[in-house]
């Protein structure tokens, strides 16, 4: 599993170090969720050969993962920090049932599943807090979520497999343009 | 091993547009944002841009009306265009990737002059 | 723009010297600051991220501290291989802005 927040896991920590503020804090939380992952998705690949598939962009279109767009003013040109701010969170929140649907389909890595939904609560719960407008935050309908994660689990082998790995791969790139866009706030 | 081969013409004549393109070898593509900096002869390093594989561009404003840096997933490969060119455009080029911090790894540079 | 002023722009010292080089950032910029070294007609060569962690491959008497708007590089026993330029980067805002650049140079 990977290290905690609040431990280093990188090769030099530097000594006396400051308390780390709430920006830090957020960025060591989404490193710690994007190393579990990796840990994630490396078990995937070894599992199937889903990482090379040339269909995957016919199952992605029917999945509707939560994606970045120059509308939600988290990159550079048109940025806003309020907006972008409600699209993380929101996305978040939408990552939620697929994260939870992850949590059955891994065998040497259940821990470490159970660990990125986990973080990923902890994480919102910062951002929630930096939030100032958190009334335009649209928390997904839960029977919606229930009838989204049935029809998945309900998927062929092979669908549940390319969804495993379609969701790990599209978590990591809304972490990754999150951390970019939370750190110019 | 990631490694980025770059290419394009190093010799320019001032307006004309510059074109270079970076391919990524043994890595992939996703994931990452893919960065061109320049260095003019004797100077520091200046970032000209990045581009996501989804397309999605980030430019430094002071070259931004000239620049635009695109994508061939297909090829993995990316490529900067810089237009109406000076003599002050000359330098070392390179392209370079970045995931959450620092420029990890960088292709070999290309000289580009641009000289009448 | 973040301004990254590094200081001194050139040095000389000798092998097994401790070496220091600093790098202000003209507002704060937490710890997203990267290090790089540069030899002559080379590409820049990462050394340290996040301020203080090290790249992998990179030889442990490189560290890197600071956080906010000053941050050190130290070498702690320079060796012959490490006679080139450093510059500093910060990668909390855009446009990614570097600094000017530090020469260390043989005695």
């Known amino acids: 599993a990977p290290v905690p927040p609040g431990e280093d896991s990188k090769d030099v920590a530097a000594p006396h170090r400051q308390p780390l503020t709430s920006s830090e804090r957020i960025d060591k939380q989404i490193r710690y969720i994007l190393d579990g992952i990796s840990a994630l998705r490396k078990e995937t690949c070894n599992k199937s050969n889903m990482c090379e598939s040339s269909k995957e962009a016919l199952a992605e279109n029917n999945l509707n993962l939560p994606k970045m767009a120059e509308k939600d003013g988290c990159f550079q040109s048109g940025f806003n920090e309020e907006t972008c701010l409600v699209k993380i969170i929101t996305g978040l929140l939408e990552f939620e049932v697929y994260l939870e649907y992850l949590q059955n389909r891994f065998e040497s890595s259940e821990e470490q599943a159970r660990a990125v939904q986990m973080s990923t609560k902890v994480l919102i719960q910062f951002l929630q807090k930096k939030a100032k407008n958190l009334d335009a935050i649209t928390t997904p309908d839960p029977t919606t979520n229930a009838s989204l994660l049935t029809k998945l689990q309900a998927q062929n082998q092979w669908l549940q497999d390319m969804t495993t790995h379609l969701i790990l791969r599209s978590f990591k790139e809304f972490l990754q343009s999150s951390l970019r866009a939370l750190r110019q706030m | 091993q990631v490694q980025l081969q770059q290419w394009g013409a190093g010799l320019l004549k001032p307006s004309e547009t510059l074109s270079l393109t970076c391919a990524i070898y043994?890595?992939?593509?996703?994931?990452?944002?893919w960065s061109w900096i320049r260095q003019p002869p004797g100077k520091g390093l200046e970032w000209i841009g990045e581009?996501?594989?989804?397309?999605?561009?980030n430019y430094n404003p002071s070259l931004k009306s000239r620049v635009t840096i695109s994508v061939d997933t297909s090829k993995n490969q990316f490529s900067l265009k810089l237009s109406s060119v000076t003599a002050a455009d000359t330098a070392v080029y390179y392209c370079?990737?970045?995931?959450?911090?620092?420029?990890?790894?960088w292709g070999q540079g290309t000289m580009v002059t641009v000289s009448s | 723009d973040i301004q990254m002023t590094q200081s001194p722009s050139s040095l000389s010292a000798s092998v097994g010297d401790r070496v220091t080089i600093t790098c202000r950032a003209s507002?704060?910029?937490?710890?997203?600051l990267a290090w790089y070294q540069q030899k002559p007609e080379k590409a820049p060569k990462s050394l340290i991220y996040?301020?203080?962690s090290l790249q992998s491959g990179v030889p442990s008497r490189f560290s890197g501290s600071g956080s906010g708007t000053d941050f050190t590089l130290t070498i702690s026993s320079l060796q012959p291989e490490d006679f080139a330029t450093y510059y500093c980067?910060?990668?909390?805002?855009?446009?990614?802005?570097f600094g000017q650049g530090t020469k260390v140079e043989i005695k």
């Open positions: 370079a990737r970045e995931e959450l911090d620092d420029f990890d790894i």
């Open positions: 043994g890595g992939s593509f996703r994931g990452y944002y």
């Open positions: 581009i996501f594989h989804s397309g999605s561009t």
């Open positions: 507002q704060g910029i937490s710890s997203w």
């Open positions: 996040a301020a203080s």
């Open positions: 980067q910060q990668y909390k805002s855009y446009p990614r802005t």
